[in-house]
Each structure stands twice: as structure tokens, then as C-alpha cells.
């Protein structure tokens, strides 16, 4: 279990840089994470909203705090979800 956990961790950390990329090839991954964020009310993979770099300005719905029951914080003048998605993704992968 610890080995597979390590692999998932490494993969997610490596893929964090894709969120701030601006190429067409990274778009699909970014869109998948946006959908995941909306479903699980989380933000980014490792460092929260900062993972998105300059893309944060281009996707208006990114990480937006829509649920006052969940922990939120201010980032670039916007209320965003405080929790990163890494634990949710690991749980999701473990269940599926």
C-alpha cells in the first residue's frame, strides 16, 4: 500500500506543473481537474490555487468558494476552497 501511495503522490506532484501550463496538450488534464474541483470542493493539487499560476485569471470558476460550510480563503481577491484536491484524488483512486 505504501508503495502505491508513493507512486500516486509522485505522479500528482509531477502533474501539478501541468495546471500552470498554457499549451493545448495540457488543456484536457486541466479540464479534468476543474471538474474534479467542482465535484469535491477542493482547489489545486499540492499548493492550492497557486498551482494554477497565471491560468487562475483565465478560468473564472477556478476553485471558487460556493459553499460557506467548507473552509475557504482569499486568493487574488477571490474566495477559494482552502483544501487541496490531493487527498480527495487519493481517496477517489483507492475506491475505484
Amino acid at each position: 500500500k505504501s508503495k502505491s501511495d508513493r507512486i500516486v503522490n509522485e505522479t500528482l506532484y509531477e502533474n501539478t506543473k501541468l495546471l500552470s501550463a498554457t499549451g493545448e496538450s495540457e488543456k484536457q488534464f486541466q479540464e479534468a481537474i476543474i471538474v474534479f474541483q467542482e465535484e469535491f470542493k477542493c482547489c489545486g493539487l499540492v499548493n492550492g490555487a497557486a498551482d494554477w499560476g497565471n491560468n487562475f485569471q483565465h478560468y473564472p470558476e477556478l476553485c471558487a468558494c460556493l459553499d460557506k460550510q467548507r473552509p475557504c480563503q482569499s486568493y487574488n481577491g477571490k474566495q477559494v476552497y482552502k483544501e487541496t484536491c490531493i487527498s480527495f484524488i487519493k481517496d477517489f483512486l483507492a475506491k475505484n
Partner: antibody
């Protein structure tokens, strides 16, 4: 080209029910949150409800909470709004919109009239 | 009574510049993006400005948005007759857990 086509509107008596549908095309429906916004005759816009891409999260305006239910069928590229216990003040054109932050594409709307 | 406050009407002559204001609070405009929508007579609304000041492709640069604190504004320069429409501001309100609109501003050219 993004297209949203609402249907299901009509005349209904107070206390009655109606189900609106919105057929979407021209984009990957399952990737987007979807919303309903309404506009009473001669009045401004009022947000009604929104649903996340996979239906985990649903949001409602206080004015419709407990009476309206938003849902979607990603296999059919269709958004729904089940409206129960309808009131005269629910009379409006109901628009289906893609996303919610912001509503970037809108349908042409379907008119719901609640009257006895 | 709308959560966001807009003037009910505004007017200008062709070529002029007009500004429409939108006032809110810290639970909406102050901590969330502002969006502007244009509704031409008898048609569905159309997105004009997102993320306070960004224009979707196809929207002329005569339209510009800005935000300061809990207020936002839409400026239209080089006014044209086809700009005659209703304009609405909108934002998510995290206290209400819902989307809120201004009451709309009817622009007459």
C-alpha cells in the same frame, strides 16, 4: 457552435408541476456546470439553480428551495428543472445557461405561466 | 430588492462614453468576480465581461469592466445605437451560497 434549447414551458395552475428540459450541443456537456436563470415579464434576471458537472453539488435560490429540483443526464446531454408547488410569482421566461461563473452561453428561454 | 445595486437607467448620445455602476458587499463583489451581461430587446442575455474586466472573444473593446472594493462598473465608449439594451451585473454571494444579479440598467442611446 454551443447551442442550448429549452423546452417544457407552458400554462400551469398554482400548486401544479412542470418539468423543463434543456438540450445541449456543441460542447462536452459532462465537463461543465449548468444553470437555470429566470426573468419575470418586464423584470430583471434572477438566478434559480446550478448543478456541478457530475451532479454531486446542487445550488438553489432561497425562493425555490424545497420546491424545485435541478438534475442532468450527461449521457443525453440534457439539463432538467423539476418545478413543484408552483406559484404565480414563478411566472417567467426560464433560461438554461452553461456554467455559472459566469453564465457564458444562454438558451433562448421557455415561458412558464402560473395562473388559474 | 436586488442584492447588487445598479441605476435603473442611463443614457448617452452616439460616440459618447457612459458608465454603469454596480454596488455590492464583501460577501459578493468584494471577494468574488463580477460579470456583466447585455440583453438586447426581445433576446436572451449575453456575457459581456467576466472576471471583473475580461472580455470574451467577439466582444468589442469599446466595452470595459473594472472593480474597486465592493463596487464595479461597466464603461461603454464610442456609444452606438445598437448598444441600446439592458445591462446586468452579477456575482456569486458566498453568504447566500447563491448567484446574485443587479436590478439591471436600461441604456438609451
Amino acid at each position: 457552435e454551443v447551442q442550448l434549447l429549452e423546452s417544457g414551458g407552458g400554462l400551469v395552475q398554482p400548486g401544479g408541476s412542470l418539468r423543463l428540459s434543456c438540450a445541449a450541443s456543441g460542447f462536452t456537456f459532462s465537463n461543465y456546470a449548468m444553470s437555470w436563470v429566470r426573468q419575470a415579464p418586464g423584470k430583471g434576471l434572477e438566478w434559480v439553480s446550478a448543478i456541478s458537472p457530475g451532479s454531486s453539488n446542487k445550488y438553489y435560490a432561497d425562493s425555490v428551495k424545497g420546491r424545485f429540483t435541478i438534475s442532468r443526464d450527461n449521457s443525453k446531454n440534457t439539463l432538467y428543472l423539476q418545478m413543484n408547488s408552483l406559484r404565480a410569482e414563478d411566472t417567467a421566461v426560464y433560461y438554461c445557461a452553461r456554467k455559472h461563473l459566469p453564465f457564458d452561453y444562454w438558451g433562448q428561454g421557455t415561458l412558464v405561466t402560473v395562473s388559474s | 430588492q436586488s442584492v447588487l445595486t445598479q441605476p435603473p437607467s442611463a443614457s448617452g448620445t452616439p460616440g459618447q462614453r457612459v458608465t454603469i455602476s454596480c454596488s455590492g458587499s464583501s460577501s459578493n463583489i468584494g471577494n468574488n468576480d463580477v460579470y456583466w451581461y447585455q440583453q438586447l430587446p426581445g433576446t436572451a442575455p449575453k456575457l459581456l465581461i467576466y472576471s471583473d474586466s475580461q472580455r470574451p472573444s467577439g466582444v468589442p473593446d469599446r466595452f470595459s469592466g473594472s472593480k474597486s472594493g465592493t463596487s464595479a462598473s461597466l464603461a461603454i465608449s464610442g456609444l452606438r445605437s445598437e448598444d441600446e439594451a439592458d445591462y446586468y451585473c452579477g456575482s456569486w454571494d458566498y453568504s447566500l451560497s447563491g448567484y446574485v444579479f443587479g436590478g439591471g440598467t436600461k441604456l438609451t442611446v
